[in-house]
Interface confidence: low
């Protein structure tokens, strides 16, 4: 069944953790729907963002961090593995030095850690998507 | 009660018509939620857009038209009468030569007609808002 959007969940992340999201754009790519995933340092939407991942479907992806309330250096990619009108599965894996973002099983983006992933307390998924799955898996110790 | 978003309704517009929308941003302005209202020429989301009105809350408003599938000259305004976290009432009135956009009873934006308003067949309201009212009123002849 559908999950509410914006979708917010408390989360603890460390090397080996993976966040998995399954959803679908709510509009055709011509209309430029967005998907956004934010890893926050607090259970407050105005808190700092360790990893900000925003897709403008059909156009580009931007990644960034928000530190002490200010956006830092934006990283942009024109890689667009998402398909117009199709369901997507997005997984964000915490590697020792970076986040690795897979789209439909294909490694698509990376973002070097600026703040340690252990600082993450909440994940929010929002903007112009319907959401059918959200899961945080932890590496078994 | 809440209306679903994206919200789509068939509509016929002409001089004297007013589209009224009541809603609330789904996120704090720091996170830059959007509101978008599109006046389409067909009951298809990929159809041309006679009037495109997009608010990036707390930052700016852009207005445009999409003709034969291509976006035209964008009009931008930094005027920001919307309040962080507050409900808004937006009304778009069809004047003989332009659209007049009122926010909370205050004239805030105008957009000259590029395509006659009679070409509009559908209105879509979407992006990062909750929606409590949508109404199209017609001037009594």
């Amino acid at each position: 069944s559908l999950l509410p959007v914006p979708y917010t969940e408390a989360a603890s992340l460390s090397t080996g953790s993976t966040v998995t999201i399954k959803g679908r754009p709510l509009a055709c790519f011509l209309n430029e729907p967005y998907l956004q995933v934010d890893f926050h340092t607090e259970m407050k939407e105005e808190s700092d963002i360790v990893f900000h991942f925003q897709v403008c479907f059909g156009r580009r992806v931007v990644m960034n961090s928000r530190e002490y309330g200010a956006w830092k250096q934006q990283v942009e990619s024109k890689n667009m593995p998402f398909q117009d009108g199709q369901e997507f599965e997005l997984s964000i894996s915490v590697l020792p030095d970076k986040y690795q973002v897979m789209v439909n099983g294909q490694s698509s983006y990376t973002f070097d850690h600026r703040i340690k992933p252990e600082a993450v307390k909440m994940v929010q998924v929002w903007r112009d998507i319907s959401l059918t799955k959200f899961n945080v898996s932890y590496l078994k110790r | 009660s809440l209306l679903p978003v994206p919200y789509t309704e068939a509509a016929s517009l002409s001089t004297g018509s007013t589209v009224t929308i009541k809603g609330r941003p789904l996120a704090c302005f720091l996170n830059e939620p959007y509101l978008q209202v599109d006046f389409h020429t067909e009951m298809k989301e990929e159809s041309d857009i006679v009037f495109h009105f997009q608010v990036c809350f707390g930052r700016r408003v852009v207005m445009n038209s999409r003709e034969y599938g291509a976006w035209k000259q964008q009009v931008e305004s930094k005027n920001m009468p919307f309040q962080d976290g507050q409900e808004f009432e937006l009304s778009i009135s069809v004047l003989p030569d332009k659209y007049q956009v009122m926010v909370n009873g205050q004239s805030s934006y105008t957009f000259d007609h590029r395509i006659k308003p009679e070409a509009v067949k559908m209105v879509q309201v979407w992006r990062d808002i909750s929606l409590t009212k949508f109404n199209v009123s017609y001037l009594k002849r």
Partner: nanobody
Framework: QVQLVESGGGLVQAGGSLRLSCAAS????????MAWFRQAPGKEREFVAA???????TYADSVKGRFTISRDNAKNTVTLQMNSLKPEDTAAYHC???????????????WGQGTQVTVSS
């Protein structure tokens, strides 16, 4: 998970009426917007009508004034009353459920198998 089963299709003469029903399983029926789409052989799936959770509705221009969509949240059903049928209404009619109120097929996550409507002249 929502499962949808349509019924009420059949063969009817032009000018006649049919009433299509869609029965939904699952306790969350009332939280979904519902719609009817139709698909004629060799053609794209076409929006017919949609209804919000609270009963607001919209129709395709081609059926406006002839078709009426309604829902009964207590019985988990959505109904399409089709009057003044025309040969061009011939198609397989599919019921759909989704989290958004839209005429776009991709906005609906759950679909029925469809019921055939044939209008003869």
């Amino acid at each position: 998970q929502v499962q949808l089963v349509e019924s009420g299709g059949g063969l009817v003469q032009a000018g006649g009426s049919l009433r299509l029903s869609c029965a939904a399983s699952g306790r969350t029926f009332s939280t979904y917007s519902m719609a009817w789409f139709r698909q004629a052989p060799g053609k794209e799936r076409e929006f017919v009508a949609a209804i919000t959770r609270s009963g607001g509705n919209t129709y395709a221009d081609s059926v406006k004034g002839r078709f009426t969509i309604s829902r009964d949240n207590a019985k988990n059903t959505v109904t399409l009353q089709m009057n003044s049928l025309k040969p061009e209404d011939t198609a397989a009619y599919h019921c759909a459920a989704g989290g958004t109120y839209s005429f776009v097929p991709r906005s609906y996550n759950y679909w029925g198998q469809g019921t055939q409507v044939t209008v003869s002249s």
